[in-house]
């Protein structure tokens, strides 16, 4: 694959990455569940990081924030936080990897600055998607942890006499802002790897313009004038490196064959 | 915590009225539903009739067409209007709270209940 098609490649992918990652912090479906059922209706509950809503099966739907809500779990606002650094690391490393790639020209910069300028947005997109499936999985961690909590505690105070508080057993289920999540984040972590690789492809190598070495198969090596190599060894392979006007081109594995020059 | 209080019961004749009223205080993110449960002597706790946020009804088969079940959410209050009540009414009327905890499983709160006599 060229250079030119890894960068674009990458940076498309880190860009449908990035767009789930948004999409993920943004949706309120990270956790679903059933809260209530009769034969009646039924009252559905998904929760995301910044709201809640209940739907029931009549179709009444009702969202409430979190703002005023106190005992949020901590990890929430951990998750919060690498959502929302992972966004902010994405939108730099989409504007970085802008000018980075190979098929804009702006200005007179050179490849080596677009070199680092990939290998900068390439890292920036790691970070990115390793936050985004960092959050996700914390957060469904945390969503385990907290229901088998709560369902071995389930009866607190007389099984749920007068007066007293009874722990609801539910079924609850990963929503699909978890999965959106973890996608995306893969999308984004193989995006700045592509870039990463690219970065190396743009990289100039002037070790092609300073210097050719010469290889030959045999252990006695004699220069005739002329410039032409000998060996020892009649029909051997050799290495016959040589030089065009181009500098940095060179022509291998050619077979060699006894000449007048050689010795036997 | 959620504090949930009772009131309205009392001793009614058979064939009359009785209008029984529960409210919900404290700290909590969200009522899902409200409802009212009866326990008679030696029997066990009952559902009567439920109602969630978005207004959806239900009601026992033995309290079917007799009462009716309303609430107002901006108050946390549920009331439940009986009529033509009959001695087989008679019981420990329970107020049932189901409280939204996010990331964690819904808790149900009860009330002390409210005696219900029906008696001539």
């Known amino acids: 694959m060229s250079v030119t098609a890894c960068q674009g490649l990458g940076f498309v992918v880190s860009l449908i990455g990035f767009a789930g990652i948004i999409a993920a912090t943004c949706m309120d479906q990270w956790s679903t569940q059933d809260l209530y059922n009769n034969p009646v209706t039924a009252v559905f509950n998904y929760q995301g990081l910044w709201r809640s809503c209940v739907r029931e099966s009549s179709g009444f739907t009702e969202c409430r924030g979190y703002f005023t809500l106190l005992g949020l779990p901590a990890m929430l606002q951990a998750v919060r936080a690498l959502m929302i650094v992972g966004i902010v690391l994405g939108v730099i490393g989409i504007l970085v990897s802008i000018f980075a790639l190979k098929c804009i020209r702006i200005g007179s910069m050179d490849d080596s600055a677009k070199a680092k300028m990939t290998l900068t947005s390439g890292i920036l997109f790691i970070i990115s998607g390793i936050c985004a499936i960092i959050g996700v999985s914390v957060f469904a961690n945390m969503l385990v942890t907290n229901f088998w909590m709560s369902t071995a505690n389930m009866y607190s105070g007389m099984g749920g006499m007068g007066g007293m508080v009874q722990t609801v057993q539910t079924r609850y289920t990963f929503g699909a802002a978890l999965f959106v999540g973890w996608v995306a984040g893969g999308l984004t972590l193989i995006g700045g790897v592509m870039m990463c690789i690219a970065c190396r492809g743009l990289t100039p190598d002037d070790s092609n313009f300073k210097a050719v070495s010469y290889h030959a198969s045999g252990q006695n090596v004699a220069y005739r004038p002329g410039g032409f190599k000998a060996s020892t060894g009649f029909g051997s392979n050799t290495r016959n490196k040589k030089i065009y006007d181009g500098g940095a081109r060179t022509e291998d594995d050619e077979q060699s064959h006894p000449t007048k020059y050689d010795y036997v | 915590e959620v504090q949930v209080q009772e009131s309205g019961g009392g001793l009614v004749q058979p064939g009359g009225s009785l209008r029984l009223s529960c409210a919900a205080s404290g700290s909590f993110f969200r009522i899902v539903a409200m409802g009212w449960y009866r326990q008679a002597p030696g029997s066990q706790r009952e559902l009567v009739a439920t109602?969630?946020?978005?207004?959806?009804?239900y009601y026992a088969d033995s309290m079917k067409g007799r009462s009716t079940i309303s609430r107002d959410n901006a108050k946390n209050t549920v009331y439940l209007q009986m009529n033509s009540l009959k001695p087989e009414d008679t019981a420990v009327y329970y107020c049932?709270?189901?409280?939204?905890?996010?990331?964690?499983?819904?808790?149900?709160?009860w009330g002390h209940g409210t005696q219900v006599t029906v008696s001539s």
């Open positions: 109602i969630t946020r978005g207004g959806s009804t």
């Open positions: 049932n709270v189901r409280v939204e905890v996010p990331f964690m499983q819904p808790n149900d709160y």
